[in-house]
């Protein structure tokens, strides 16, 4: 039950921040004109990864897409790419993960396989959760370098006594929405690594004979994957040979400390 | 069609407050900013300040401390009051209704004369 | 606040001549994002409120005659009048659209010779 609830709640929280994953990317405040301390203007700027925006006071809205990739600076098409990768391996994830959910029966899909692509969807979800982490802390990076240098030569001079007012961006409110969906996929990711643990089922241990070689100790386990021999210097804590018989399901109830070496 | 029509008392005495109420018709409030601007006989035009649809105003910084601007949409109506005039704040007082993009002003009222003297 | 210089103050014309007129910003109006002058230029005919006749330093205003044609980016700009007509002898003003408080040059009066 536990195991079914961290799943879920995994997915749900992934599911979350993959769809703020994708609003940020799509979101035309990545960075904002910085209004302190700077000369009063009808005119507000805004820019995101794709296009940059203008908003009159009037309410007037112009937008602008980049139409080139070339002339774009290294850093944008970074994050660009980081944000996209986050999204594609998130949108794999949810797939994975919507078949590897407890509650949903497909056929006759072994736990194990559940287990397996649980895990799969996780590291998905970590690895899309810490690239949209990455690409917007590239930005905001990106920002911070840029105001700065451009507070240093606030106004630049335009032949004598004309001026010209430097815009300066400062954060936009698309990436503290990258910076949250991204720790969200990040933290669904881990619970979902977490119930993958749960739902592992243990080694299939078969009513089996133990034959006893003169020479070393073989325990030979029919349809299992696993010879144990008496090779190798921690054989003696391997748990080889249950004994008892119990039933499948026993088997997969009571795991035992030895079932996680 | 879109029409601005300022109204004002004509006279006022120094030192006392002008009110001057734009009614506007053709447009919302709502959507679009109202400017005033006055002129003296004779000068130019100088911009007293800005009431936009949202509500965001902004003045003169020389008449800052003078001046209001308020608005009434459901009666469609923009209100400017000015305290402690003086003569030289004689003009001739414009409404006008700012343009959706280029921050320009596309309709203007007829305008109201304002004359301080005792 | 920004200063506004136009200038000639005045201009003695005769019809169908080409008349210019420049308007200097004391910063520039350019804005970087949608790379737009925010200047607007003003037609004032004697005993009428103004008329607006550009915006964006360059959009001419719907109803607006294409001999009238503005120009001019950063902190300066110009009007030109290719052809003058009897009907556009007023005095014309050109505004900083681009920061707080909006402010309006001395004008340009256009007199007939």
């Known amino acids: 039950m536990a195991v079914t609830a961290c799943q879920g709640l995994g997915f749900v929280v992934s599911l979350i921040g993959i769809a703020g994953i994708i609003a940020a990317t799509c979101m035309d405040q990545w960075s904002t004109q910085d209004l302190y301390n700077n000369p009063v203007t009808a005119v507000f700027n805004y820019q995101g990864l794709w296009r940059s925006c203008v908003r009159e006071s009037s309410g007037f809205t112009e937008c602008r897409g980049y139409f080139t990739l070339l002339g774009l600076p290294a850093m944008l098409q970074a994050v660009r790419a980081l944000m996209i990768v986050g999204i594609v391996l998130g949108a794999i994830g949810l797939l994975v993960s919507i078949f590897a959910l407890k509650c949903i029966r497909i056929g006759s899909m072994e736990d194990s396989a559940k287990a397996n692509m649980t895990l799969t969807s996780g590291i998905m979800f970590i690895v899309s959760g810490l690239c949209a982490i990455a690409g917007v802390s590239v930005f905001a990076n990106m920002l911070v370098t840029n105001f700065w240098m451009s507070t240093a030569n606030m106004y630049t001079g335009m032949g004598g006594m004309v001026q010209t007012v430097q815009t300066r961006y400062t954060f936009g409110a698309a990436l503290f929405v990258g910076w949250v969906a991204g720790g969200l996929t990040l933290i669904g990711g881990v619970m979902m690594c977490i119930a993958c643990r749960g739902l592992a089922p243990e080694e299939t241990n078969y009513k089996a004979v133990s034959y006893h070689a003169s020479g070393h100790s073989v325990a030979y386990k029919p349809g299992g994957f696993k010879a144990s021999t008496g090779f190798g210097s921690n054989t003696k804590n391997k748990k080889i040979y249950d004994g008892g018989a119990r039933t499948e399901d026993e088997v997969q109830s009571y795991p035992s400390k030895h079932d996680y070496v | 069609q879109v029409q601005l029509k300022e109204s004002g008392p004509g006279l006022v005495a120094p030192s006392q407050s002008l009110s001057i109420t734009c009614t506007v018709s053709?447009?919302?409030?709502?959507?679009?900013?109202v400017s005033w601007i006055r002129q003296p006989p004779g000068k130019g035009l100088e911009w007293l300040g800005v009431?936009?649809?949202?509500?965001?105003?902004y003045y003169n910084s020389a008449l800052k401390s003078r001046l209001s601007i308020s608005k009434d949409n459901s009666k469609s109506q923009v209100f400017l009051k000015m305290n402690s005039l003086q003569s030289d704040d004689t003009a001739m007082y414009y409404c006008?209704?700012?343009?959706?993009?280029?921050?320009?002003?596309?309709?203007w009222g007829q305008g109201t004369s304002v004359t301080v003297s005792s | 606040d920004i200063q506004m210089t136009q200038s000639p103050s005045s201009l003695t014309v005769t019809a169908g001549e080409k008349v210019t007129m420049s308007c200097k910003s004391s910063?520039?109006?350019?804005?970087?994002?949608?790379?737009?002058?925010?200047l607007t230029w003003y037609q004032q005919i004697p005993g009428q409120p103004p008329k607006l006749l550009i915006y964006?330093?360059?959009t001419r205003e719907s109803g607006v005659p294409n001999r009238f044609t503005g120009s001019g980016s950063g902190a300066e700009f110009t009007l030109t009048i290719s052809s003058v007509q009897t009907e556009d002898l007023a005095v014309y003003y050109c505004?900083?659209?681009?920061?707080?408080?909006?402010?309006f040059g001395a004008g340009t009066k256009l007199e007939l010779k």
């Open positions: 006008a209704k700012q343009r959706y993009g280029g921050n320009a002003m596309d309709y």
């Open positions: 053709g447009f919302s409030l709502t959507d679009y900013g």
């Open positions: 009431m936009w649809g949202g509500g965001n105003t």
């Open positions: 910063q520039s109006l350019l804005n970087s994002g949608n790379q737009r002058n925010y």
């Open positions: 964006w330093a360059s």
């Open positions: 505004q900083n659209s681009y920061f707080y408080p909006f402010t």
